[in-house]
């Protein structure tokens, strides 16, 4: 259960994180499982442990094997296993499947390719990016922080992308490469200014005091994958989380794709045990994307229970 596969290339840096987490103050001991031999913590060693991280600087094929990490919490010793495989460098350009990280998909509007595992390393920008072993050049390609952005993505942009960066450890530099496939979704999407389907502008919603009430904010943003789109509720111009009323919570609904292909989002505002003071609040349904923000305001009014005697 607490086991993780890690892989790397010989003569490159490889850093592996213990599959068990813990507070920074917890001691973590590492062992080579086959021999139960403790991994040293001294940085002068080529392979050494540094808290939750196991560092191969650089890695060798003979380092392959299962490593055990034990996180010593105040109560239990929690055990994890890192299954490490170090491969020989390929002479040709093809990256074998066993060296590939998870495939990512993109579209014309959303084409970020993250460099896998980079957050484990001490690296400085810029990253180098390659596609099918060729260095990426041209204004369409932008290396930004830990990801690559491709402008105006086309079907031909699909392929294997490799990021290359330098890990620095105590003044020594080590190369790291990581490869993942990128696929292009064939969709002619578009985004438009948000359209709020519900609630209607300045809607008055009838509620019963003491009962629960739900308000749904529903908006559509265009067709296909949306780069940035969100719906949320505000109370008197304040985010729900900051408003500090535990009875009133928002709960994300399902992304909805209607038959006409529109990309829509719902956000349900749940009010438990409606109180008189809730009627005084202004409830704003906000929908926003790259085009801008649209707001519909709702107010609550008391629903009078039906008087059967009148």
């Amino acid at each position: 259960k607490f086991s993780k596969q890690s892989w790397g290339l010989e003569n490159e840096a490889l850093i592996v994180r213990c599959p068990r987490q813990g507070k920074p103050s917890y001691t973590v001991d590492w062992y080579y499982s086959q021999t139960n031999k403790s991994i040293p913590t001294q940085e002068r060693n080529r392979v050494f442990a540094s808290g939750q991280l196991l560092k191969f600087l650089p890695a060798a094929v003979a380092d392959s094997g299962i490593y055990t990490c034990i996180v010593r919490s105040p109560t239990f010793n929690r055990t994890g296993y890192a299954n490490v495989t170090i491969y020989k460098k390929q002479s040709d350009c093809n990256v074998p499947d066993y060296l590939m990280y998870s495939t990512v998909s993109g579209s014309e509007k959303n084409s970020k390719i993250y460099c896998p595992t980079i957050d484990l390393y001490n690296w400085t920008a810029p990253l180098e990016w390659f596609k099918n072993c060729q260095a990426l050049q041209g204004s369409r390609y932008r290396a930004h922080k830990s990801f690559l952005v491709i402008d105006n993505v086309m079907t031909e942009d699909a392929g294997d992308y490799t990021c290359k960066f330098i890990h620095n450890e105590n003044g020594a530099n080590y190369s790291v490469t990581a490869t993942r496939s990128f696929t292009v979704k064939d969709e002619q999407g578009f985004s438009l200014f948000p359209v709020i389907g519900a609630p209607a502008q300045n809607e008055i919603k009838e509620v019963e005091i003491g009962k629960n009430a739900n308000l749904t904010c529903s908006a559509c943003f265009g067709k296909g994958t949306q780069f940035l789109a969100a719906v949320l509720w505000q109370l008197n111009g304040t985010k729900i989380t900051d408003f500090g009323e535990p009875r009133i919570q928002q709960e994300e609904g399902q992304n909805q794709s209607f038959s006409n292909g529109l990309a829509c989002l719902d956000m349900v505002l749940r009010i438990a045990d409606v109180k008189e003071e809730d009627l005084l609040l202004q409830y704003d349904c906000l929908a926003l994307n790259l085009h801008g923000l649209r707001r519909h305001t709702v107010r609550l009014s008391r629903k009078n229970p039906i008087d059967h005697h009148s």
Epitope: K1, Q21, K23, V71, S73, P74, F76
Partner: antibody, heavy 121, light 106 residues
């Protein structure tokens, strides 16, 4: 959602034993350690120990080590706390509790409703 | 074992006032957790890891401190905040709680 449901109130005589159960639901039972905390009437909270449902391993507060036994039944996602050689000062509400994220020990985010154990002759 | 001492034992305040609860530790700890308990109810986690707000807890609650001195602050007391508050350490076994601070209406 995460739920910890405990067994009902118990009345025991001094010297007897009591076994309180805590049935977990809404998450993978073996992924989270479960703890027992007790509270005597009008008093504060006292940690008794914890069990790892995956392995059955336990860690007890030294104060209770000779008298407490924590066990689990993975088939019913239930943990048990048995306290023996009861005395009147063991009269308390016994709670089972769970952290929000196991590995970070980030406080008891989930609690059972409590089980009142009364020890009286 | 690590001993947690809460002060004051009782705090008498009015709604709207600021409440400052202290927890002093017998030996240094890395983190502190805080709970609220009302009569007949199980405790509720308010603050974890010294200063992080637990899920669903209003922003008027905040935590601070380090080493041997920790503080829970309620910026403006609401009627529902009158309860008993406990600090708890998870630095070493046995896990221990403070004796509690009762916040009562003045």
């Amino acid at each position: 959602q995460v739920q910890l449901v405990q067994s009902g109130a118990e009345v025991k005589k001094p010297g007897a034993s009591v076994k309180v159960s805590c049935k977990a639901s809404g998450y993978t039972f073996t992924d989270y350690e479960l703890h027992w905390v007790r509270q005597a009437p009008g008093q504060g909270l006292e940690w008794m120990g914890t069990i790892d449902p995956e392995t059955g391993d336990t860690v007890y507060n030294q104060k209770f080590k000779a008298r407490v036994t924590m066990t689990r039944d993975t088939s019913t996602s239930t943990v048990y706390m048995e306290l023996s050689s009861l005395r009147s000062e063991d009269t308390a509400v016994y709670y089972c509790a769970r952290a929000f994220y196991n590995d970070y020990d980030d406080g008891f985010a989930y609690w059972g409703q409590g089980t009142l154990v009364t020890v009286s002759s | 074992e690590i001993v947690l001492t809460q002060s004051p034992a009782t705090l008498s305040l009015s709604p709207g006032e600021r409440a400052t609860l202290s927890c002093s530790v017998s030996s240094s700890v890395s983190y502190m957790h805080w709970y609220q308990q009302k009569p007949g109810q199980a405790p509720r986690l308010l603050i974890y890891d010294t200063s992080k707000l637990a899920s669903g807890i209003p922003a008027r609650f905040s935590g601070s401190g380090s080493g041997t001195d920790f503080t829970l602050t309620i910026s403006s007391l609401e009627p529902e905040d009158f309860a008993v508050y406990y600090c708890q350490q998870w630095n070493s076994s046995p896990l221990t709680f403070g004796g509690g601070t009762k916040v009562e209406i003045k």
